[in-house]
């Protein structure tokens, strides 16, 4: 697994003219694990990065990802409750210049090297689920979430709101 040392925590203005497109309002480092406490790890294999879901040994260090939070450009009122906040989307970067991407054709989650502005496939709508868990919904494919399948990350279609709490799309964020 590779570390986050190449990623600098830095502060940006909300509308930074030096960056094309929107800029994150908040960024911080966190490790990502499944509902069942398996760790999401990243490894360089054959000149490409692979993503694994695995149990770590007792003292093995967790990989960190840089979580960047972006405000949508319009208020989100799909619930009809008059909430005036703007919907948040996140990008996840485990190492410098690489971001998690949704490959909707292959129903897979991949690490791609890319430059700003990031493509829509790198953005995920953040959901709060039960037990301090979050879920990541594809910006490019509403109703499709990052999930766990066969010890890998995959894209999983969620058909109804009752299935939003299915364990394989629930993740925990930890800063320790």
């Amino acid at each position: 697994a590779f570390g986050i040392s190449g990623v600098q925590k830095y502060t940006r203005a909300l509308h930074d003219s030096s960056i094309t497109g929107i800029s994150p309002i908040t960024e911080y480092l966190a490790s990502l694990s499944t509902y069942n406490d398996q760790s999401i790890t990243f490894a360089l294999e054959d000149e490409s990065y692979e993503i694994y879901v695995e149990d770590l040994k007792k003292d093995e260090k967790k990989d960190k990802v840089l979580l960047s939070y972006y405000e949508s450009q319009h208020p989100s009122n799909e619930s009809g409750d008059g909430v005036d906040g703007k919907m948040l989307m996140v990008t996840l970067s485990p190492t410098k210049d690489f971001w998690l991407h949704a490959n909707n054709k292959e129903h897979s989650v991949e690490l791609h090297k890319c430059e700003k502005p990031l493509p829509d496939q790198a953005f995920f709508v953040l959901h709060n689920m039960h037990s301090n868990c979050v879920s990541f919904e594809c910006k490019t494919d509403p109703g499709v979430f990052i999930g766990v399948k066969d010890n890998h990350l995959a894209l999983i279609k969620v058909d109804s709101s009752e299935n939003l709490c299915t364990e394989n799309i629930l993740f925990k964020l930890s800063e320790t």
Epitope: I25, Y69, L173
Partner: nanobody
Framework: QVQLVESGGGLVQPGGSLRLSCAAS????????MGWHRQAPGKQLELVAV???????NYADSVKGRFTISRDDTKNTVYLQMNSLRAEDTAVYYC???????????????WGQGTLVTVSS
């Protein structure tokens, strides 16, 4: 509806201290992070500090070692202790929170109205 109310701003001399508070209220189900941004006259909005639900923090380089962010989860309140204040810290300080409400799982960004901090002799 989620409301953020800031307090604690004011006039302080260089080298002095202030403590800002921000209380979140409304139909809050889960808070992911709470933080502070600031906007100085003629400047862009910038992140000052953020604290996550797990207790992780991130600071702007310009305030590291001088400002401390903390959070009281039981009150959905975030604090910013500002020490060794400088003239360049003069700005309107805005509270920002990422949270979901009882009516939707989607996480949204909410902002307070801001509180003015003036550092001047």
């Amino acid at each position: 509806q989620v409301q953020l109310v800031e307090s604690g701003g004011g006039l302080v001399q260089p080298g002095g201290s202030l403590r800002l508070s921000c209380a979140a209220s409304g139909s809050i189900r889960t808070v992911n992070y709470m933080g502070w941004h600031r906007q100085a006259p003629g400047k862009q909005l910038e992140l000052v500090a953020v604290v996550t639900s797990g207790g992780g923090t991130n600071y702007a380089d310009s305030v590291k070692g001088r400002f401390t962010i903390s959070r009281d989860d039981t009150k959905n309140t975030v604090y910013l202790q500002m020490n060794s204040l400088r003239a360049e810290d003069t700005a309107v300080y805005y509270c920002n929170a990422a949270a979901s409400t009882y009516s939707s799982t989607v996480v949204r960004s909410f902002w307070g109205q801001g509180t003015l901090v003036t550092v001047s002799s």
